[in-house]
Interface confidence: low
């Protein structure tokens, strides 16, 4: 708490300007009117205040707005945002995407802080759903944002928002998250033609079921090995050798390098060796020729 002292004669601030950087902390407290500060917040960013001076300015705003800052002040917080605690931010009601962008800009280049996480949470909850414009903004600043959400939170993402998602936004998503996102992507891109559709859906395929992979194998998509390796093992296992060959196209030769890794390893174990031999890649570990293959659902139960 800064001690209350009278403002020295002639030092009362009429404007928020560079002269204030020469004020001591107690002079800022005594001589800067909180209401003036609130109306001229946009000037604070252009003035090289010390962190200690910013603490005083924050304290003045806290006193003026004990229930939380209005959006007109929040939008112009600039570097003062870095001084806010999650508790401060929980009092805010941020509805404008421009305000959100302005604050994310301040934190740009840094990991998502608890303050930013709280701000985003408040904003999204206020909007009721993660709409396309919001998602576009958040993933631009934090490519990993989408994958930081729980499957439950992702379920509120409307399919129309999927158009804002870039492949790198999904890099850290786990299979449970892709299980939620894939059906939304499928719906969002359903009216695109074959090659365009595959370009868009490719990043989401870690959530695709077997029947969709079978359908893709009929469309000459030439899936790369990196994408194939991210597919759900349970979705890959029922695919035949011919289907995988069609799905991968010229990339099928990459199976050899991945034969010890899932899902390729598990898939090999489910194929007849003579079928694998038709690929000419020297893949080993398939079901020996002449062996009886049990019904696959039965095989699952026995394993």
């Amino acid at each position: 708490e800064v001690e209350k002292t009278a403002c020295p004669s002639g030092k009362k601030a009429r404007e928020i300007d560079e002269s204030l950087i020469f004020y001591k902390k107690w002079e800022l407290e005594a001589c800067v009117d909180a209401a003036l500060l609130a109306t001229q917040m946009d000037r604070v960013n252009a003035i090289p205040f010390t962190y200690e001076q910013l603490d005083v300015l924050k304290h003045k705003l806290d006193e003026l707005y004990p229930q939380g800052y209005p959006e007109s002040v929040i939008q112009h917080l600039g570097y003062l945002f870095l001084k806010m605690s999650p508790e401060d931010i929980r009092k805010w009601n941020v509805t404008s995407l421009e305000t959100l962008k302005a604050l994310l800009e301040v934190n740009k280049g840094h990991e998502m802080s608890p303050q930013v996480a709280t701000l985003i949470d408040r904003f999204v909850k206020g909007r009721g759903q993660l709409d396309k414009d919001t998602l576009d903004t958040l993933t631009a600043f934090y490519p990993g944002y989408l994958c930081s959400l729980s499957p439950e939170e992702l379920s509120s993402v409307p399919p129309s928002s999927i158009w804002a998602v870039r492949p790198q936004d999904l890099d850290t998503c786990d299979p449970r998250q892709l299980d939620v996102l894939y059906p939304k992507a499928r719906l969002a891109f359903q009216n695109m033609n074959g090659s365009e559709y595959f370009v868009k859906i490719q990043s989401f395929l870690g959530g695709a079921p077997t029947e969709d992979l079978k359908a893709l194998s009929q469309q000459n998509v030439s899936m790369d090995l990196a994408t194939f390796m991210k597919l759900r093992t349970d979705a890959v296992l029922p695919l035949t050798v011919a289907e995988v060959q069609k799905l991968l196209g010229p990339h099928v030769e990459g199976l050899k390098a991945e034969e010890r890794h899932r899902p390729v390893r598990d898939w090999i174990l489910r194929q007849r060796q003579d079928d694998l031999d038709t690929l000419g890649l020297g893949l080993q570990g398939g079901i020996p020729n002449g062996y009886l293959v049990l019904d696959l659902s039965m095989q699952e139960a026995l394993s």
Epitope: K108, G109, T137, A140, F141, P143, R166, P167, Q168, N193, S195, E196, V199, Q202, D224
Partner: antibody, heavy 120, light 109 residues
Framework: QLQLQESGPGLVKPSETLSLTCTVS??????????WGWIRQPPGKGLEWIGS???????FYSPSLKSRLNISVDTSKKQFSLKLSSVTAADTAVYYC????????????WGQGTLVTVSS | EIVMTQSPATLSVSPGERATLSCRAS??????LAWYLQKPGQAPRLLIY???TRATGIPARFSGSGSGTEFTLTISSLQSEDFAVYYC???????????FGQGTKLEIK
């Protein structure tokens, strides 16, 4: 007015590393709307895309150059850089830096280019 | 990779006349195709993107058409400043693997 300016040595010896920097002025390199790319053009020949980088540092490389290539960004200096290792005479070209919108793969703004010759 | 083939390699046309340049993709690139103009000693300049949308500041005499694998750039009435090399570029692939055509040189007849 956006300007892109390539800089770096004009002569590199075979087997060494070619290093170029592009400085962005009159605009923000940290814009979430753009990637920053490199394209090259051997003397008298056509254009070849090398790679692109986002302000977060994520990059995409041409498959044919990937094993020798590194593209990075330094937002504080408003620069992005290209490093191509183990160069040969075939890497002699005019190297351009350019901007591309992140939702599209076209190049809407280019630097004036810098000629790099690989020779002993 | 997708190979882009431009034709003809050189096109001789008189000022004021119409010029038609072709670009063919080895597989469909949808409408994700751009055209660039390059004058000697200068960097390329974006003319057209999305097959038919003119870039900012590009005159209406430039127009693009096509889809899939066949594309055309038309210059309706050639001006002296239009004589240059023209390149097409596809940007349909993911991961990005952008490829350019080998260029068409448009020269004064």
């Amino acid at each position: 007015q956006l300007q892109l300016q390539e800089s770096g040595p004009g002569l590199v010896k075979p087997s060494e590393t070619l290093s170029l920097t592009c400085t962005v002025s009159g605009g923000s390199i940290s814009s979430s709307s753009y990637y920053w790319g490199w394209i090259r053009q051997p003397p008298g020949k056509g254009l070849e895309w090398i790679g692109s980088v986002y302000y977060s540092g994520s990059a995409f490389y041409s498959p044919s150059l990937k094993s020798r290539l590194n593209i990075s960004v330094d937002t504080s200096k408003k620069q992005f850089s290209l490093k191509l290792s183990s160069v040969t005479a075939a890497d002699t070209a005019v190297y351009y830096c350019a901007r591309r919108p992140y939702k599209s793969g076209l190049f809407d703004f280019w630097g004036q280019g810098t000629l790099v010759t690989v020779s002993s | 990779e997708i190979v882009m083939t431009q034709s003809p390699a050189t096109l001789s046309v008189s000022p004021g006349e119409r010029a038609t340049l072709s670009c063919r993709a080895s597989q469909s690139v949808s409408s994700n195709l751009a055209w660039y103009l390059q004058k000697p000693g200068q960097a390329p300049r974006l003319l057209i993107y999305g097959t038919s949308t003119r870039a900012t500041g590009i005159p209406a005499r430039f127009s693009g058409s096509g889809s899939g694998t066949e594309f055309t750039l038309t210059i309706s009435s050639l001006q002296s400043e239009d004589f240059a090399v023209y390149y097409c570029q596809q940007y349909n692939t993911w991961p990005p693997e952008y490829t350019f055509g080998q260029g068409t040189k448009l020269e004064i007849k």
